[in-house]
Amino acid sequence: SIPWNLERITPPRYRADEYQPPDGGSLVEVYLLDTSIQSDHREIEGRVMVTDFENVPEEDGTRFHRQASKCDSHGTHLAGVVSGRDAGVAKGASMRSLRVLNCQGKGTVSGTLIGLEFIRKSQLVQPVGPLVVLLPLAGGYSRVLNAACQRLARAGVVLVTAAGNFRDDACLYSPASAPEVITVGATNAQDQPVTLGTLGTNFGRCVDLFAPGEDIIGASSDCSTCFVSQSGTSQAAAHVAGIAAMMLSAEPELTLAELRQRLIHFSAKDVINEAWFPEDQRVLTPNLVAALPPSTHGAGWQLFCRTVWSAHSGPTRMATAIARCAPDEELLSCSSFSRSGKRRGERMEAQGGKLVCRAHNAFGGEGVYAIARCCLLPQANCSVHTAPPAEASMGTRVHCHQQGHVLTGCSSHWEVEDLGTHKPPVLRPRGQPNQCVGHREASIHASCCHAPGLECKVKEHGIPAPQGQVTVACEEGWTLTGCSALPGTSHVLGAYAVDNTCVVRSRDVSTTGSTSEEAVTAVAICCRSRHLAQASQELQ
Amino acid sequence: QEDEDGDYEELVLALRSEEDGLAEAPEHGTTATFHRCAKDPWRLPGTYVVVLKEETHLSQSERTARRLQAQAARRGYLTKILHVFHGLLPGFLVKMSGDLLELALKLPHVDYIEEDSSVFAQ
């Protein structure tokens, strides 16, 4: 029967008595930077070309005995998970291996850099189809390793890496912390985060998604027909490298941004038990388990968006946090979140010719996060319209006044330390879908976009008194682009998007002792692209 | 522009015999930074990745590496250039004493220097 991990990543329509999805990634080359591998193992023979690249440190210990099967163990298993005949994800993908880890599974940042440079030079000498680079390794945070990954990604290469097995914030490790890399955490057959001895999978905002990473059956270097079960975020990353190879084989022109958005879009949502993660990391960690798309084509009509969290601002009075989208994504909205509730909102601003989302901490606050909603919107022309604090009037309002521009997100930023002491009336933006409304002492920022066939609508859900969380979701066929709260009182900890749901978090009334007069409303802006839908229908 | 370690003129003469053109002095106002792994057991002191500014050409990388070797030798330190990077990042990998970091950070074109560190199979 089909191994649990292959079943988990396979959409129901492919689930017969065996795993045989269409097109096994035959147009794609997957580079593996790992240990040496047994390339003639029955599971991978003819699928893996061992390059002559080798850059590894000496093994530790004077009595170390170099046993070939042990030296090859990690890399052979991963090559099998990516492209193995019987237990592989992308059975048609061809692979090239570079040895950057020694027989003890240890390498260096410098050796990995030289390996990445080797791949870039090979790509220039002999351009082939799409390239996926699998980095099933981790070290401490490294500026230079992250920079090299960024350069390779900008050269059109898809990099996939292990989040790390340290039961820690993946942002503290490299290449897991590189924003351009697809970083993968590990889950088990019960969709729980994987525990590995006293440690386990890494987590946090630097993880893009999770994938099967416990008891994964794959090629064993113990013999040419042997299989073995291994666990770790390397195994999880190998699944995503295989899925990426299949997606790129079906759509070779996909950019890294498009691929990442599709991986997120087709993932199983909200199946991971978040209680395993430290409390402060739960909101930052994506609840996504990778899966193959239900069909190899036809996803192009969707408006894809993802949520990007910034690093924590830190607690100083003027601290800010910035969340950025990838180069070919559009920032369609910006929100902020603070566990203490002490924040001064957020704003979209230009930085280096691109919009970024900046959140502001407040005096006495423990720090804030900026949350960017990053979307794929071809031929988009977006701008930010700002209204300064209205002071005397009912509230601050701003709308998209340019012809053909629609509202995709609202942000508000204030200088006063605590808006809660300046209670405004609750404002309703009824009848004016292209308008942002906020506190009279806040400046309001509207994200206004023009793109072919783009249409958006506002959805709200309010509850009479703060109860910890208010949510509002976009319906099928619509994509959440903006998420904000009304009003911006001190009750509100912040707003953020989780998949297609806008979540507004607020302090519980019971803990603040406030009156129940104040309602908290979650405001979602839901968009779709008629242009993309029509274009895809014309293709079919 | 004067080289802060006083070796600049002497070195230029040495370089001139090797190749045409004056070796550039470091730009003022931009300070190169040093980075190392926060996890102490994973550090590999003695090997450093010297990363040069983005538009640096291979020839300049090689020249900067030779300059470092020359200045280090003058101070009685042996250095070994293990690899010159080009294609992804401009720079070089050098085996040297940590005592030379201050000197290396003042070299022209240097953006930052990172001490090598371990990575592990996951």
């Epitope: 390339s39 003639d40 023979e45 003819g46 070309m49 061992v50 005949r85 059975k91 013999c223 040419s224 | -």
Partner: antibody
Framework: QVQLVQSGAEVKKPGASVKVSCKAS????????ISWVRQAPGQGLEWMGW????????NYAQKVQGRVTMTTDTSTSTVYMELRSLRSDDTAVYYC????????WGQGTTVTVSS | QSALTQPASVSGSPGQSITISCTGT?????????VSWYQQHPGKPPKLMIY???NRPSGVSIRFSGSKSGNTASLTISGLQAEDEADYFC?????????FGGGTKLTVLQ
Amino acid sequence: QVQLVQSGAEVKKPGASVKVSCKASGYTLTSYGISWVRQAPGQGLEWMGWISFYNGNTNYAQKVQGRVTMTTDTSTSTVYMELRSLRSDDTAVYYCARGYGMDVWGQGTTVTVSS
Amino acid sequence: QSALTQPASVSGSPGQSITISCTGTSSDVGGYNSVSWYQQHPGKPPKLMIYEVSNRPSGVSIRFSGSKSGNTASLTISGLQAEDEADYFCSSYTSTSMVFGGGTKLTVLQ
């Protein structure tokens, strides 16, 4: 192009040994092992075993285990299959083929065991 | 006695389609994606026609196709031609080795 070239025909007496060679060329040797398959006159194919060019590891079929030895000489890209204690029912055409997938075959070596 | 069962012979006229079956168990055909089919003309070595159940090596006519259901694999040859007359063998992985079928003699009726 990918080629497997085998040694010439052999006639052996029962109890003797035979050593057949197979020289590989035209591909990355370490990406595939070599399988040995035999075919008795008018019969089907029988898989005898496999050897790795990468590390010399072997995998023998149970039926010939103990009588067969496969070796490699990486310097000449050649694989050898030695069969000992020959019997008359070992009379067959012996083929080498690339890997477990057996996508490329040698031309075959006829081994006749006769007293 | 071969591990995989094939019909001893099949025949068909030029232009027709024929199918050769290859039956094993869940420990071979049913358990692996690696069923291959070989064509062998008299006095010649076998030639790979289908690998991994349904894949065709380059140079093999599209008239040859393979499939698998449960523990049985099948080779279908459409638009029979005189040169298709040969012996056909299936093979499959087992946990530690390889097994072949006994072979099927295909006769193209003239």
